[in-house]
């Protein structure tokens, strides 16, 4: 427990000290206070150093003295023979005595008083940072005004903290700018902007006087700005030594002000303005930027569009632009977007045709489509070469998104009709000579395919039976056989309006308008066995000359039999339409004069008994094309005739070529377009 | 195929937070914007904010600046919305939402009542 | 932020009836606008957009118009399964904000 004064004798004293002891006292007085040690008495055996007995004083880890040997007051009026003043309120006095005395000692008699100390005055390092006030027991300090005591009761600072400016523009200064700054001080300033904004600071050179650093290159006062992570300084010197423009990329700005005890100058003034954030001018591939800028900055808003074939995806469906807006935080929104190549997908597949698969579906690839040659062409053009274009359609120079078609190729047989054995009235062909040939099997007649849903024949063949069976694509049409050729199944027939209808069919006498359309439920594959004739033209190339040749098929009536089991066909000519006028009717059911005959038909034959007989009736009377020898087109359709193996009257098809088109026009099927 | 499901309805007192979590399934969260959007009872539609999870940035509405936290963690392909010192006026059906050009597939919802 | 307002708040209607909901954007938002359909219960569904392209899967009765400031979305013959709340959304840029809604009731 502290005290204000004590006595320290010697082991015995006044008596002699024994030997070999060692003893120790510690002494304290109360915090503030210095100890005055002093000795009234000291008789302690002499040696070099008082190695041998001694006494010692000791404050801290510093000796303040060591004594032996005898002492007298200098002073008569004082019994004080040694003294020790320190400005602590510890101290520790330590006897010690070795084995032997050669005489007798009496030790030492010693007291010590509590004393006041000036902490202002007494220490080296000085208490307080401004003004030291002391009294007995201790001190206190005091500040200059506008200054305040800091916490640790010793520092004298100004308050320069706490400010927060949130204005988009302003100015900031040291405190007294542009006197000197106060020592000891550490001054914090907070910018807090609207996110969106960064706090931009710019400052003059000579607006700007701190003291100056120390050799190790150190701040002794220093001016920091802290902006998130980033850290710009610390700062210090005469005239600013950092960039007078400094972009913080933050909204929210730290200052931070701080001051040693010494060396004050004049500090420095700042100003400072909020920017929108920039946004990066991105590269974005494929894509245009509008508005175009050298600079984006927080809310500016761009169109990005995709360049001509590029397109930004979402699931199934796409844009070929989008907005995106520069945000607070110094990004881009819709950043993840990227116009990529549009993909037109895998190509329709079309009718009668193909189309190889593509290496790619992207914008810029290519593709073709080709028709089953050589039973098919492409009827629209346009080559069949198809790009995939920046509408993510597959589009073609001509016919542009519109598909190919493939059409059958008309008239053009596999392979040529050549009358090889001569045999009355005709020669055997086969089906390939022929592929337009239709067998109906009720009445036995005949008819010829003009394209994929369309058979012509003879009015009278389907006046009958309006849901006629038919059959191509077989020589020979035993029941056997049949059964393994195409069965084409009839839709409609459409007998031209033209034809006149009879209650008694049988007394026929007026053929004219001869002529009829099937439309079949379903399209007829093309092959070398099956294969539509051409129409004829309409101009006057498709007039018929007498002498110009034809040729007739079907498995109608020979000279052997009633009804041919394999087809049979033979090249006539024509002839002028007397010719037929002057046979008389073999089987006459009226009167000859009776017998119609108008310039709807052409007389054909009478040359070496080749004739159409019963049973080819609706078959074509197909001649080569003026215009393009490799095809043949249906001049006529086998009608009727005064007698077998003589002359015979064709149906001439091309006075009826705008019905026909227009009959299959009007009736023709989605399918069909 | 695409879909996304919210966690359970919650009930909380004044001043709690509430995370509810949005699990994506059929597509990576990487490859689209997340975002929130929150409905009162018989109100309309509020957008609160949105994260593209392949960077972790987030812009939120001003209204919820502070208060919301939308996070991602695209190991489990989900997003998550944070929302703290909840007052009774967040009582909500709060949706989370995957766009690129338009906000093309939705939760579920998830039912928030704050209440003391 | 832009504000988006919807007229009417609601309206009544019959099936079959062509029905015209406006939507208003306080400022030009280009055709960064989108149409969704919110059945109670449900989660809204997106019908239009960009302002004039019907999304995937919605019928054809559905269109939409306009853009800048001044949208439409139309519904030319009414269906039962139509009678909902309509929203509309500007994506011009963040917020994003939404319409109040207009609800479509049988009359």
């Known amino acids: 427990e502290p005290t204000m004064y004590g006595e320290i004798l010697s082991p015995n004293y006044p008596q002699a000290y024994p030997s070999e002891v060692e003893k120790s006292w510690d002494i304290e007085v109360p915090e503030g206070y210095g100890i005055h040690l002093y000795f009234t008495h000291l008789d302690i055996e002499l040696s070099e150093n008082c190695a041998y007995d001694s006494v010692q004083i000791i404050s801290g880890d510093t000796e303040e003295g060591r004594l032996c040997g005898q002492r007298s007051s200098n002073n008569p009026h004082s019994p004080i023979v040694e003294e020790f003043q320190v400005p602590y309120n510890k101290l520790q006095v330590i006897f010690k005595s070795d084995f032997s005395n050669e005489e007798r000692f009496t030790g030492f008699a010693a007291y010590y008083v509590a004393t006041d100390i000036n902490e202002c005055t007494d220490f080296v390092d000085v208490p307080c940072s401004h003004f030291c006030n002391n009294f007995i027991g201790g001190y206190f300090c005091s500040c200059p005004p506008e200054y305040f005591l800091h916490d640790d009761m010793k520092n004298c600072g100004v308050n320069c903290s706490g400010d927060v400016f949130t204005a988009l523009i302003g100015e900031i200064a040291s405190p007294n700018y542009p006197k000197p700054y106060p020592e000891n001080s550490r001054c914090e300033y907070q910018i807090r902007l609207e996110k969106g904004f960064q706090v931009v600071v710019t400052l003059r050179r000579e607006d700007f006087d701190v003291e100056a650093a120390d050799s190790a290159g150190n701040c002794l006062d220093s001016l920091v700005f802290v902006a998130g992570d980033r850290q710009f300084g610390p700062y210090c010197g005469h005239g600013f030594p950092g960039p007078l423009n400094i972009e913080t990329k933050s909204n929210a700005l730290d200052i931070i002000f701080q001051t040693d005890l010494t060396g004050q100058k004049k500090g420095w003034k700042l100003r400072y303005h909020g920017d929108p954030m920039p946004c990066p001018k991105e590269d974005t591939p494929n894509s245009v930027w509008e508005p175009a800028k050298a600079k984006y900055v927080f809310r500016d808003v761009v169109q990005i569009t995709c360049l001509d074939g590029f397109e930004v995806v979402e699931g199934r469906v796409g844009a070929t632009s989008f907005y995106s807006t520069c945000q607070s935080n110094g990004k881009w929104s819709n950043s993840k977007l990227k116009c990529q190549p549009v993909d037109c997908g895998i190509p329709e597949s079309i009718e009668n045709g193909k189309v190889e698969d593509p290496e790619s579906t992207l914008f810029g690839s290519v593709i073709r489509y080709t028709c089953e040659e050589p039973y098919y062409y492409m009827e629209n053009g346009g080559g069949g070469e198809y790009h995939c274009a920046g509408n993510g359609s597959w589009v073609n120079e001509v016919l542009g998104p519109e598909l190919p078609k493939c059409v059958p190729v008309c008239g053009v047989p596999r392979e040529p009709f050549e009358e090889k054995q001569r045999i009355i009235g005709g020669s055997d062909a086969d089906i390939k000579n022929f592929p337009w040939q239709v067998f109906f099997d009720n009445p036995w007649a005949g008819g010829a395919l003009i394209n994929e849903y369309w058979v012509l024949t003879a009015a009278h063949v389907v006046e009958g039976n309006r849901e006629p069976t038919m059959y191509v694509g077989s020589t020979s049409v035993q029941t056997s056989r049949l059964a393994k050729s195409k069965m084409l199944t009839p839709e409609h027939v459409f007998i031209h309006p033209g034809w006149k209808l009879l209650e008694v069919p049988e007394g026929r006498t007026n053929f004219d308008n001869d002529i009829a359309l099937v439309r079949l439920k379903d399209p007829v594959k093309m092959g070398p066995t099956v294969s539509p004739i051409c129409l004829p033209g309409t101009s006057s190339d498709y007039n018929l000359m007498d002498g110009d040749l034809g040729l007739i098929s079907g498995w109608g009536r020979t000279e052997k039999r009633d009804r041919a089991v394999r087809l049979k066909a033979a090249r006539l000519p024509v002839a002028p339409l007397r010719k037929c006028k002057e046979v008389k009717v073999e089987k006459p059911t009226a009167d000859a004069e009776a017998y119609v005959f108008t310039p709807n038909m052409i007389c054909a034959g009478g040359e070496k008994g080749m004739d159409s007989c019963k049973g080819d009736s609706g078959g074509a009377f197909a001649v080569q094309d003026p215009n393009d020898k490799t095809k043949f087109y249906a001049a006529g359709l086998v009608s009727w005739g005064p007698q077998c193996g003589t002359y015979g009257l064709y149906t001439r098809v091309k006075n009826y070529v705008d019905w026909i088109m227009k009959t299959m026009q009007e009736n023709s099927t989605p399918r069909e377009d | 195929q695409v879909q996304l499901v919210q966690s359970g309805a919650e009930v909380k007192k004044p001043g709690a937070s509430v995370k509810v979590s949005c699990k994506a399934s059929g597509f990576n969260i990487k490859e689209y914007y997340m975002h929130w959007v929150r409905q009162a009872p018989e109100q309309g539609l509020e957008w609160m904010g949105w994260i593209d999870p392949e960077n972790a940035d987030a812009i939120y509405a001003q209204k919820f600046q502070g208060r919301v936290t939308i996070t991602a963690d695209t190991s489990t392909n989900t997003a998550y919305m944070e929302l703290s010192s909840l007052r009774s006026e967040d009582t909500a059906v709060y949706y989370c939402?995957?766009?690129?050009?338009?906000?093309?597939?939705w939760g579920q919802g998830t039912l928030v009542t704050v209440s003391s | 932020d832009i504000q988006m307002t919807q007229s009417p708040k609601s309206l009544s209607a019959s099936v079959g009836d062509r029905v015209t909901i406006t939507c208003r954007a306080s400022?030009?938002?280009?055709?960064?606008l989108d149409w969704y359909q919110q059945k109670p219960g449900q989660s809204p569904k997106l019908l239009i957009y960009s302002a004039s392209y019907r999304y995937s899967g919605v019928p054809s009765r559905f269109s939409g118009s306009g853009s800048g400031t001044d949208f439409t979305l139309t519904i030319s013959s009414l269906q039962p399964e139509d009678f909902a709340t309509y929203y509309c959304q500007q994506q011009y840029t963040t917020p994003y904000t939404f319409g109040q809604g207009t609800k479509l009731e049988i009359k």
């Open positions: 939402a995957r766009s690129r050009l338009f906000f093309a597939y």
């Open positions: 400022q030009d938002v280009r055709t960064a």
